[in-house]
């Protein structure tokens, strides 16, 4: 009897949906795998007789529940199917946004770029899928533990009146208030402010 694939899970980030699994121990030889998805009550092959332990389901509709299954095969034998249900719009992980930071005197000017979606138009981003899309920004003085959070209203934000000649670090994530679903933080960007622009009287 052929054992089923183990640890079957969907690794989905920004709607790049990769079904992954692990090959079970099997003494007779190398296993192959077939992965399918349910479409109009019929299972359709997505990856057939593959030696890989993953299958790309990024073409699935973003909405609704999808039933996926995978089994192991050897010669004319096969394992039972292992099923999971996956809802991309709920289950996908929101990857880190892009961020551009520019120093102007004692201010940091930031522009945010929503993560792009795989297999879509070049301009299509996570912001197009989620109506409530917003950003969380956190910043701190480099070398200190205290972090400050703000929620910009737009795709840009300015941190003003910062201490001159001080290095500040900033990171951003996507956030969906209606779902309380937070994305992954971007890597911190650290920049040093310059002089205070205020003119002495």
């Amino acid at each position: 009897m052929v054992p089923p694939p183990e640890n079957v899970r969907m690794n989905s980030v920004n709607f790049k949906n990769i079904l992954q699994w692990e090959s079970p121990a099997f003494a007779k030889g190398n296993l192959t795998f077939t992965a399918q998805y349910l479409s109009y009550r019929i299972f359709q092959d997505k990856c057939m007789n593959t030696t890989l332990t993953e299958c790309d389901f990024s073409s699935l509709s973003k909405y609704g529940d999808h039933t996926l299954r995978v089994r192991a095969e050897f010669a004319d034998e096969h394992s039972d199917w292992v099923n999971i249900t996956f809802c991309p719009v709920d289950d996908t992980i929101i990857g880190p946004p892009g961020m551009q930071v520019e120093v102007l005197a004692d201010s940091l000017h930031m522009r945010f770029l929503a993560p792009k979606i795989e297999n879509e138009y070049e301009t299509w981003t996570m912001k197009n899928v989620y109506n409530s899309w917003t950003y969380n920004v956190q910043y701190w003085k480099n070398g200190t533990d205290e972090k400050f959070q703000i929620t910009p209203q737009y795709d840009f934000e300015v941190l003003r009146n910062l201490e001159p000649w001080t290095t500040y670090c900033v990171q951003v994530r996507g956030f969906l208030p209606d779902r309380n679903k937070a994305g992954e933080w971007s890597e911190p960007v650290c920049e040093q402010t310059t002089h205070d622009e205020t003119v002495p009287s």
């Epitope: 529940d65 249900t85 996956f86 709920d90 289950d91 779902r179 309380n180």
Partner: nanobody
Framework: QVQLQESGGGSVQTGGSLRLSCAAS??????VGWFRQAPGKAREGVAT????????YYTDSVKGRFTISRDNAKNTVYLQMNSLNAEDTAMYYC??????????????????WGQGTQVTVSS
């Protein structure tokens, strides 16, 4: 900020059942896990569930006995525990937002934690 509150713990005889609940203070469409910690032992993963509830993972010792589920309309995740035995005695915690590795049952991947509910199984 997500706040989690566990309930449903208590004392039960060997072979008995309990249903734990984990209520989020606001809607939380992220992965959720149940973990437990017995006195003098490390915190270990028990079960996790995906945001939509369509995928679940269990540690080997509870497979076939415990069932994790969620009701997103009620912002609540449940752990139904059957055929309990003395080894299940522990403080049970729920945790939310397991990131990319939520299915691995590792405490360090989860961002938000409840205060815990005690489960005691006696013969």
């Amino acid at each position: 900020q997500v706040q989690l509150q566990e309930s449903g713990g208590g004392s039960v005889q060997t072979g008995g059942s309990l249903r734990l609940s984990c209520a989020a203070s606001q809607v939380n469409m992220n992965s959720v896990g149940w973990f437990r910690q017995a006195p003098g032992k490390a915190r270990e993963g028990v079960a996790t569930i995906s945001p939509s509830g369509g995928a679940t993972y269990y540690t080997d010792s509870v497979k076939g006995r415990f069932t994790i589920s969620r009701d997103n309309a009620k912002n609540t995740v449940y752990l139904q525990m059957n055929s309990l035995n003395a080894e299940d005695t522990a403080m049970y915690y729920c945790a939310a937002d397991g990131g990319r590795d939520w299915w691995l049952l590792r405490p360090q991947t989860f961002s938000y934690w409840g205060q815990g509910t005690q489960v005691t199984v006696s013969s």
